[in-house]
């Protein structure tokens, strides 16, 4: 059974993740990111159900094209490159997910926009929070 | 608007450490990235460290492995902790608060803490 300080480690890492997939968003809503038309081209991979951390191997599967799409950006000067935020992210949901079990991710038929996408992934963050909390 | 104090400066021998903290108040957002910047006499600005709410973090090549920033986000503090310091590290250290995780005009700055590395 999960210990009050596992559930709150837990926790704490969904929030980590839910703030950089925020940070993300934020940034490609920008309406100065002059990047945006051509990065709502790119169609991410969502997943059929999203209930659980065993199911964020959907969202880690998804991490290397996130990257690549992000990288459009090319901004003059990064505080934090997408390779940052990414590499963070990436840490988080190995920790999160576990590698205990291999969990094959199932995918829903329609591909969705990079903000469909985080704003998903945004809403598995927040749900999961909601019930430890 | 944002306010930013930073603190920690000061003169320290080769080889010494120091920690910079920097505090924020103001119009703060829960996402947001806070860091060092740096200007050593004659150069431009230079990141150093910078490190986003969520943990995401960017270090200068020259102070990967010397460096090490860190945050309180229930404080709005971000601390810089400079071991193994080189005289080339001496400059003007600017704390830096901003809403993306790229450079634009919303971006804040602290005034500055001189950091002197000499013997």
């Known amino acids: 059974a999960p210990t009050s300080s596992s559930t709150k480690k837990t926790q704490l890492q969904l929030e980590h993740l839910l703030l950089d997939l925020q940070m993300i968003l934020n940034g490609i809503n920008n309406y100065k990111n002059p990047k945006l038309t051509r990065m709502l081209t790119f169609k991410f991979y969502m997943p059929k159900k999203a209930t659980e951390l065993k199911h964020l191997q959907c969202l880690e599967e998804e991490l290397k094209p996130l990257e690549e799409v992000l990288n459009l950006a090319q901004s003059k000067n990064f505080h934090l490159r997408p390779r940052d935020l990414i590499s963070n992210i990436n840490v988080i949901v190995l920790e999160l997910k576990g590698s205990e079990t291999t969990f094959m991710c199932e995918y829903a038929d329609e591909t969705a926009t990079i903000v469909e996408f985080l704003n998903r992934w945004i809403t598995f963050c927040q749900s999961i929070i909601s019930t430890l909390t | 608007e944002v306010q930013l104090v930073e603190s920690g400066g000061g003169l320290v021998q080769p080889g010494g450490s120091l920690r910079l903290s920097c505090a924020a108040s103001?119009?703060?957002?829960?996402?947001?990235?806070m860091g060092w910047y740096r200007q050593a006499p004659g150069k431009g600005l230079e990141l150093v460290a910078a490190?986003?709410?969520?943990?995401?973090?960017n270090y200068a090549d020259s102070v990967k492995g010397r460096f090490t920033i860190s945050r309180d986000n229930a404080k709005n503090t971000v601390y810089l902790q400079m071991n193994s310091l080189k005289p080339e590290d001496t400059a003007v250290y600017y704390c830096?608060?901003?809403?993306?995780?790229?450079?634009?005009?919303?971006?804040?700055w602290g005034q500055g803490t001189q950091v002197t590395v000499s013997s």
């Open positions: 830096m608060y901003a809403s993306s995780w790229y450079e634009d005009e919303t971006d804040y």
């Open positions: 103001g119009s703060i957002f829960s996402i947001n990235v």
């Open positions: 490190i986003s709410s969520g943990g995401s973090t």
